[in-house]
Structures are given as structure tokens and as C-alpha cells.
Interface confidence: low
């Protein structure tokens, strides 16, 4: 057994540039030739245990064989030189690992950052992958002094081991080196103070002002290298539920500061704030954002009164009536605070008044048949809204003036209502709506619109294929005008069932068919027309179309003594639905006729 290898491969540590050619040689020792009775022609080259084709191999002399590879692309190849001893037994002589890759690119985009409280970190773009072990060294020096090299672990960044010295320029560059070459980046020259990224401001607090409901005061603590740097700020805020931030103009926060008053905010609204800082010259990097802090602006009196309406309940007799005053809770944007209660004042025409404090959104009062004026104001802890005023006329007064050209139509999944105003100046409009049903009472919802509005959409949660009865009432200073109503659908569908047809009268050659209107709950839309299909057991089917206003129809030119099958369908704008089939037989003779 030979302890010494039988030969060697040269080069022993081959590194090849990808895409280039490469030649290796295997030199056998003289002792080996004699021991195994071989020469170089017995050499078998293998890559990753697979024999290399003969055409790539050249026998140079009795001890030496070469192998040539063109366009090397594999990152790593096990190359072995083997001999066929005694003509058949394969014996390994020597093996090497052949690596391929690229020389390093010149590093680019070299940038450095000094995170406050940490050493300087520099980053660069190393360029294309080398596929080889490549060392990246960050070098830095003053004009007169070199700093310790920084050996990069990842090849794209390095944090220097020394603390930065501010207000003195430093030169920094990167050297990249591997088995195929060595290259340096362009150097950059800067003062580390201009590369500082401050730590985020902290202890951000938000306070409101009782005097001004539109402001919030911010205060915070800045670091800035322990006061070494003057910092300017960037302040952003949003309402609690919003996803987008509002920017305080940067020119307002350019000077170094640790407090700021944000203006033009909405009353009684929660805002979330965040702040970051940078060197006041604008050089360096913005800090990360501070932790968010929130605050709520102070309440302001409600900006408008609630929508206000009333309904007269069935009369208790001649002496008095029960009136239910109803109103809508103000949206937050108008309430400007927590509504504590509502103040309702009812004034009789003789100047007798009664004040009620109500926490809910309705109040039922008993009134005589005189005219009353009702006023309603919403109250929060700052004050009261302006009053909404309603005149409740005597029940003996007939309402005059109503809207004209009332229309309703669906659009964009909303039910729109439009009208032409009456000729007399209006204070506001009340829209009321409910689902028409034979199975349940018409439970009304309502909304109020300003006097300038003559087109709006219903703001309730409407259901498809339900018939809505919509009423529009103009309200004047003297009280409500006349009400106009119509029916509308948010979205129609085909009817749930078709009509059930029956015969009202059957003659020898004609039959009067009758049917009931489909209940409104099953209509699912406006019934536009009916179709009547009729046939005999052997005859062709006949179809007649009937207007939706009819509930009977006479079939004529029928054959006597014949069984007829009849079916009706009802159609909305969205399709039709058949009713059940019905059969009848015409008599053989007309009344009074004999054979």
C-alpha cells in the first residue's frame, strides 16, 4: 500500500472565471508507473464521479495527461485523476475541487449612517454575485491617520469599531478581493455629523385646551447627541380611525423646538400624533418615528340642531291629541362632544310653555287642538346647539302646498328621490319611508333635508325586492305642507310566485278568466304585465299578454267540449314567474242550444 499519492493534479486549488476555458494536468510519479505497469494513457479523468469524454483529454507524454474544459459554468466540481491498473482496476491518483465564479465588481452606492449612540455603519452595493469567497474591507482614514479596517461579515455592510469623531472629515472606501481579483470603490469624504440619524423623540404628550376646541398642544423630548445637535421636527397626525396621516407643514417646524400647537382641528375628536427629527440643516437622516401619542380636542357646543319631526297619534277625543316628537341623534362631527340631553320647549299660542329635559330621541306630549311651536336643542357639556323649530298646527288646519313631480329611482345601490319644490319658501323637507307588506305594519324611518335640497337618497339600510312607500313633506314656518307619496324598489327581482288563475264563466266558445293581484310581499318589483298561456291536450299553445291593471280576461274562439290547460305568469322589470296550471272544459252546447 502506497502512502504517497501516485501523482498530482496541477493547479492544486483551481479557481476559474465563469465562461472561460481551463486546463488541468495530472503528472504520474515514475514509481507509480512501474508499480502498476501503467503510463499516462491509462489515466481516466472524472468530474463529480463521471468520466470526462476522451476528446477533452490529451496525453502529453508517458507521465502526463491534460484535460481541458470550455465555458466553465458549474460553481464547484470535484476533479479526479484515476488510473486503470492492470488494465481494469480503477485507482484514484489525486483529486482537487475546481471552483468557478467572477472577480468582484467595483462596489457602488457607498453610504454611511451614524445611528445616534452607535458606531458608524456603512453600506454598499457589491454588484453581481461572485460565487466565490470574497472579502469586503471597509477602509477609512483622516488626511493624516488611518482607522482600523472593518471586515464585512455579509459583504454589503460593516459597522466600524471606533466611535465617530464629529466636525472632522473622514474618507471611506471599500476594497473587494477574491481569488480572481481585487477592486476598490470610489471613496466618499464627509463629516460624520452630517450622517447622523437621531434617536426618535420620546415622552410625546398631547394636551387639549378648554379655551380652544380646535387645538392640541404637543410636547416631547429630543436627544440630538445630548444637545450637541440642533434638530428640526416633522409632525404628523390623523384621526383615531383614519389610515392616512396629515402632515404639519415642515416650514412650521424648521426651528429647533420641543413643543408645538396643532391648529384647525375638529372639536371633540381623538387625534393620534407622531414625530421624528433630523439635524436642522437637513443633512443626515430622519429619526424613526416616535411612539404614537393621542389626545382629544376639547368639546365645543353642537354645531347644528338635530333633525326634528313629529307624528300625531290617534286622537283621544275632542279635548286633546297625543303628539310624538321625534329627532335624530347628531353625528359626532356635529355633536362636537357627548350629547348629555335634549331640551324641548313647547309653546302654546297663548304663550304658555313647558320645558322638558330628555335623554332619548323622542318625547310624547299631550296637546290641545291649538297651534303649538316646539323647539329642540341638543346639549353637551360646553353648551347648547341652535334650536330646531317646528310649528305644530291645529288639527283643523288643512295642509296646503306639496312638492310636485315626485320621482324615485335606484342608482349605485342607493334609492334616490327627487322632486320639484312648492311655490312657497320651504324651511326643510321630511322624507319618510317604510316597507309595504300585508304581513307586517309599515314601520317608518325618516330623514330631514335642507330647504335647498330637491334630490337625495334614503339613508336607511334598505332591502332589495321590497316595496318602499316613500313620502315627501315640505315644512314651512307655519307648519307641514301636504305630503306626496310613491312606491319604489331599491332593486327589483322576478316575482316570488305567479298568479293563480280561475274561471269566472265558461261558455261553448269562450271563457272568462279571473285572478287576484299577487300580494305585495311576493311581487318583488312593479308588476308590468301578465301572460296567459292556454292549450288543449293536442293543440298548439297560445299566449296572450294582458296589462297589469286587469284582473280578468276573456278567452274567445275556443273549441266546444274541449279540455283546456291555462297558466298565467306575472312580469316585473327583472323577469317573470309562472303560477299554477289550471284546467277547464268548454261545454258541448251553448246555453239553450240543443243537438
Amino acid at each position: 500500500q502506497l502512502l504517497e499519492p501516485c501523482g498530482y493534479i496541477y493547479p492544486e486549488f483551481p479557481v476559474v472565471q465563469r465562461g472561460s476555458n481551463f486546463t488541468a494536468i495530472c503528472v504520474l510519479k515514475e514509481a507509480c508507473l512501474q508499480h502498476y505497469y501503467v503510463n499516462a494513457s491509462y489515466i481516466v479523468w472524472k468530474t463529480n464521479h463521471a468520466a470526462v469524454p476522451r476528446e477533452q483529454v490529451t496525453v502529453i507524454n508517458r507521465t502526463t495527461s491534460s484535460v481541458t474544459f470550455t465555458d466553465v459554468v458549474l460553481p464547484s466540481v470535484q476533479l479526479t485523476c484515476n488510473i486503470l491498473s492492470f488494465g481494469q482496476i480503477e485507482q484514484n491518483v489525486y483529486g482537487v475541487t475546481m471552483l468557478s465564479g467572477f472577480p468582484p465588481d467595483k462596489p457602488t452606492n457607498l453610504t454611511c449612517i451614524v445611528n445616534e449612540g452607535k458606531n458608524m455603519l456603512c453600506q454598499w452595493d457589491p454588484g453581481r454575485e461572485t460565487y466565490l469567497e470574497t472579502n469586503y474591507t471597509l477602509k477609512s482614514e483622516w488626511a493624516t491617520e488611518k482607522f482600523p479596517d472593518c471586515q464585512s461579515k455579509h459583504g454589503t455592510s460593516c459597522m466600524v469599531s471606533y466611535m465617530p469623531t464629529y466636525y472632522v472629515n473622514i474618507e471611506v472606501w471599500v476594497e473587494a478581493e477574491n481569488a480572481l481579483g481585487k477592486v476598490s470603490s470610489e471613496s466618499i469624504n464627509f463629516d460624520p455629523v452630517d450622517k447622523v440619524k437621531p434617536t426618535p423623540p420620546y415622552n410625546l404628550s398631547v394636551t387639549n385646551s378648554e379655551e380652544l376646541s380646535s387645538i392640541l398642544k404637543l410636547s416631547w423630548v429630543s436627544s440630538g447627541l445630548g444637545g450637541l445637535l440642533d434638530l428640526k421636527s416633522d409632525i404628523q397626525y390623523r384621526t383615531k380611525d383614519a389610515s392616512t396621516w396629515i402632515q404639519v407643514p415642515l416650514e412650521d417646524t424648521m426651528s429647533p423646538r420641543t413643543s408645538f400647537t396643532v391648529q384647525d382641528l375638529k372639536p371633540f375628536t381623538e387625534y393620534v400624533f407622531r414625530i421624528r427629527s433630523i439635524k436642522d440643516s437637513g443633512k443626515g437622516y430622519w429619526s424613526d418615528w416616535s411612539e404614537e401619542a393621542s389626545g382629544t380636542t376639547y368639546e365645543d357646543r353642537p354645531s347644528r340642531p338635530p333633525s326634528f319631526w313629529y307624528k300625531t297619534n290617534p286622537s283621544h277625543g275632542q279635548e286633546y291629541r297625543s303628539v310624538r316628537l321625534i329627532w335624530k341623534a347628531l353625528p359626532l362631527s356635529e355633536a362636537n362632544g357627548k350629547i348629555l340631553d335634549y331640551e324641548v320647549i313647547l309653546t302654546q299660542s297663548k304663550s304658555v310653555s313647558q320645558t322638558y329635559t330628555v335623554t332619548g330621541t323622542e318625547l310624547t306630549v299631550n296637546l290641545t287642538n291649538d297651534r303649538y311651536v316646539a323647539s329642540l336643542a341638543a346639549r353637551n357639556k360646553v353648551g347648547k346647539s341652535a334650536a330646531a323649530v317646528l310649528t305644530i298646527p291645529s288639527p283643523h288646519v288643512t295642509a296646503a302646498y306639496s312638492v310636485v313631480n315626485l320621482k324615485a329611482f335606484p342608482k349605485d345601490n342607493l334609492l334616490w328621490v327627487e322632486w320639484t319644490p312648492p311655490p312657497k319658501p320651504v324651511s326643510k323637507y321630511i322624507l319618510e319611508w317604510c316597507v309595504l307588506s300585508e304581513n307586517a305594519p309599515c314601520v317608518e324611518d325618516w330623514q330631514q333635508e335642507d330647504a335647498t335640497v330637491n334630490r337625495t337618497h334614503l339613508r336607511g339600510r334598505l332591502l332589495e325586492s321590497k316595496c318602499y312607500q316613500i313620502t315627501v313633506t315640505p315644512v314651512f314656518a307655519t307648519g307641514p305642507g301636504g305630503s306626496e307619496s310613491l312606491k319604489a324598489y331599491l332593486k327589483q327581482a322576478a316575482p316570488a310566485r305567479g298568479p293563480t288563475v280561475r274561471t269566472k264563466k265558461v261558455g261553448k266558445n269562450e271563457a272568462v278568466l279571473a285572478w287576484d293581484q299577487i300580494p305585495v310581499d311576493d311581487q318583488n318589483g312593479f308588476i308590468r304585465n301578465y301572460s296567459i298561456s292556454y292549450r288543449t291536450s293536442v293543440g298548439k299553445e297560445m299566449v296572450v299578454h294582458v296589462d297589469s291593471s286587469h284582473t280578468e280576461y276573456t278567452l274567445s274562439s275556443l273549441s266546444s267540449d274541449t279540455l283546456y290547460m291555462v297558466r298565467m305568469a306575472a312580469y316585473t322589470d327583472e323577469g317573470g314567474k309562472d303560477g299554477p296550471e289550471f284546467t277547464f272544459t268548454t261545454p258541448k252546447f251553448a246555453q239553450g242550444e240543443i243537438e
Epitope: T359, G360, T361, E362
Partner: nanobody, 125 residues
Framework: QVQLQESGGGSVQAGGSLRLSCGIS????????MGWFRQVLGKEREGVAA????????VYADSVKGRFTVSQDSSKNTVYLEMNGLKLEDTGMYYC??????????????????WGQGTQVTVSS
Amino acid sequence: QVQLQESGGGSVQAGGSLRLSCGISGFTYRPTFMGWFRQVLGKEREGVAAISTGGGSSVYADSVKGRFTVSQDSSKNTVYLEMNGLKLEDTGMYYCAASTVITSVSINRGLYQYWGQGTQVTVSS
């Protein structure tokens, strides 16, 4: 999963007191108002009292006004019914109910979507 769990029922002598509790859980959004109902065997379930979970405003059935008080502890997600001066006719199964209908607080049974299993109150002479 929405759950309402009543507790605190039991037997008491006329003129006595009981305090019912109702724990609520599983709501994505809290109910608009919570109510207490009672049912005597063979009779319709009737509204006793209700409280708005937002403003705390409440309504009562005439038969319990001045004797019963409904309250809530938002932090514990619990609604209570304090019953004083109990009468024989207050006997029945008491149910806690929750409504998500956005309307004024009410003891209208039809406005309630979620119901508890009930707790028995028995008033004896």
C-alpha cells in the same frame, strides 16, 4: 359566538329583594340596548326593563316602576336588574336579551335578536 348568561334567580318572600345579573360575551360590537323580560307559564313573554348600553338611559314596564332598577357595568360586560318590593305576580322566568337595532331603548320584544336561557324567580307569601 354571542352568549347571554343570566344568574341570581331564586325563591324569595313577598316584599323581599333579588338582584339578577346578565353576562354578555361574543359581540363584535356591543348591543345597542339590553333588556329584561319575564314569562309566566301560559302567558306571553313581557318586557320588564331595558337600558341603553351607550348612554345608560332606561325604560321600565309600568308594573315594576319604582321597584325595579336596571343598571350596567360596561367594564364587566354585565347588566343587572335590582328587584325590590317583590310581589307574588313577579313570579316567572326572567330572560336577559340584547338588541343590535339602532333605535331608542325599548322593551319591545320584537327588537331583540339575542336571548339568554332564563333564570327562575319565585315569590311566595
